[in-house]
């Protein structure tokens, strides 16, 4: 998996008028890491290790271009013609990344009203857009008015690119990133589902990165793919992630099934509570 | 005592034939079973898999979409659909149980004495 | 599919002395790893499960170790009735048995 800094910035329009508040939301290797969701941005790092990544320094400076960013985008729905009546939306993602071989990719996308209409590679500077009349004539507009900013248009979007990568590299340095392995709590439950069968549920949270395998086995052999149910892996809000596998089983074969756990090289197996006892927790280190 | 007895082989023709398995001694509807081979002079080659329910079964590459398997829990009964044989398909054929013992990985811990099949074209 | 390799795949040893099988996996399998001993004419018998756990009623003389790739059942001190062919088998991925290894009087 790439290191990857991605960037979600969206300002909305009411009538025509782009309204003065803004949204940014920052995710460093797929994980809530930043957001700005008041009038005057506030950079607010998304839990705990969000904030080991930069230790006790300040959020200025990613206050002020998150800031500068907000502008510059409410500034480009404003150029939007044809705005209708109501509430409109212009967001702009903004994607770099860090191989394994250390090539980099980076990228840029604008959506209006949730659709996708313009495309840039910042390292090719070329630019790409859907095949809509729509979208071709939003596109258009956005072209239109980023050329005739020619100044913002080499200080700022070309140097996205760099700015982008400069920032994850910061953000790598610290180190929390690359080490981070927190495992998973597994915890399974049990419920009676219809006569003579129960549905047994396998969750794990908090653990980070977010590839895991969670399935169950009878007997030591996994059940197949099309007797089990999965959650999606989901950010759980603090920095890590949470998924689930539930099946259906004959009471009284319990112990025969077992819950196996598979994360960052290490796995465990955690069988169905028997009785009465309804939850089972266990943390392996 | 818990004992698996396999029946049907003998010579076959290439077109098709079914092996039984019968169990004993042990609650069979709660078991997982398999159906293992072994060609003369050659080493055991898994082909496939049921557990207790019917709803996961697994087959080797060798045999995919050729033999099928299933079970009858109420006649405690394992039995192996081959169609298609080929002259490869000669083999001691082995029922066998998967182990319920807590912590098992998947080990047969009770085998039939096994039935040769013998492909005659 | 995961493929085990067993070696060697023969061997000669005397009665007392300490044997040693391998049986390396194409991917890590952890710990989903099971021995047999077959001998000739006869079914195969659960040694050893979850790669070192002894079977009940198998002499204690066998043993088995190793996880991820690399397995090894050990016969610490090897008897007549124990000369045979033993197979390893893994269920991590569906199931599949090595190759054998062939153990005969020296």
């Known amino acids: 998996e790439p290191h990857s800094l991605r960037y979600n910035l969206t300002v909305l329009s009411w009538d025509g008028s782009v309204q003065s508040g803004f949204l940014t939301e920052v995710h460093l290797d797929g994980q809530p890491f930043l957001r700005c969701d008041r009038q005057k941005c506030r950079a607010k790092p998304q839990g705990q290790w969000a904030e080991d990544v930069l230790g006790n320094k300040t959020w200025d400076r990613e206050t002020r271009d998150l800031t500068g960013n907000g502008k510059d985008l409410r500034m480009t729905l404003a150029h939007i013609k044809d705005q209708k009546e109501g509430l409109h939306s212009l967001q702009e993602i903004r994607v770099c990344e860090i191989h394994e071989d250390n090539s980099t990719r980076s990228s840029q996308h604008f959506y209006y009203d949730g659709e996708l209409f313009l495309s840039q590679n910042l390292e090719t500077k070329e630019w790409t857009m859907p095949q809509s009349s729509r979208a071709q004539t939003l596109a258009m507009n956005v072209r239109n008015f980023l050329k005739e900013d020619a100044m913002k248009t080499k200080t700022h979007y070309h140097a996205m690119h760099a700015d982008c990568l400069q920032e994850l590299r910061r953000y790598l340095k610290s180190g929390v990133v690359l080490r981070r392995t927190v495992p998973p709590m597994v915890n399974v439950t049990r419920s009676e589902a219809s006569e003579g069968n129960i549905t047994v549920t396998c969750r794990a949270s908090g653990f980070y990165p977010w590839n895991i395998t969670l399935s169950w086995r009878q007997d030591g052999v996994s059940l197949s793919h099309d007797t089990q149910q999965w959650g999606d892996v989901l950010p759980d809000g603090n920095g890590t992630y949470q998924t689930w596998v539930a099946t259906r089983i004959c009471q009284g074969e319990e112990q025969r099934f077992t819950c196996y756990m598979e994360h960052s090289g290490n796995h465990s197996t955690h069988p169905v509570p028997s009785g009465k006892v309804l939850v089972l927790q266990s943390h392996w280190q | 005592e818990v004992q698996l007895v396999e029946t049907g082989g003998g010579l076959v023709q290439p077109g098709g034939s079914k092996l039984s398995c019968g169990a004993s001694?042990?609650?069979?509807?709660?078991?997982?079973m398999n159906w293992v081979r072994q060609a003369p002079g050659k080493g055991l080659e898994w082909i496939s898999y049921?557990?207790?329910?019917?709803?996961?079964?697994y087959y080797a590459d060798s045999v995919k979409g050729r033999f099928t398997i299933s079970r009858d829990n109420a006649k405690n009964s394992l039995y192996l659909q081959m169609n298609s044989l080929r002259d490869e398909d000669t083999a001691v054929y082995y029922c066998a149980r998967v182990s319920s013992i807590t912590g098992n990985t998947g080990a047969f811990d009770v085998w039939g004495q096994g039935t040769m099949v013998t492909v005659s074209s | 599919d995961i493929q085990l390799t067993q070696s060697p795949s023969s061997l000669s040893a005397s009665v007392g002395h300490r044997v040693t099988i391998t049986c390396r996996a194409s991917?890590?399998?952890?710990?989903?790893l099971n021995w047999y001993q077959q001998k000739p004419g006869k079914a195969p018998k659960l040694l050893i499960y979850a790669a070192s756990s002894l079977q009940s009623g198998v002499p204690s003389r066998f043993s088995g170790s190793g996880s991820g790739t690399d397995f090894t059942l050990t016969i610490s001190s090897l008897q007549p009735e124990d000369f045979a062919t033993y197979y390893c088998?893994?269920?991590?991925?569906?199931?599949?048995f090595g190759g054998g290894t062939k153990v005969d009087i020296k």
């Open positions: 991917q890590s399998i952890h710990n989903y």
């Open positions: 001694g042990f609650t069979f509807s709660s078991y997982s």
């Open positions: 088998q893994q269920s991590y991925s569906t199931l599949t």
């Open positions: 049921i557990n207790s329910r019917s709803n996961t079964i």
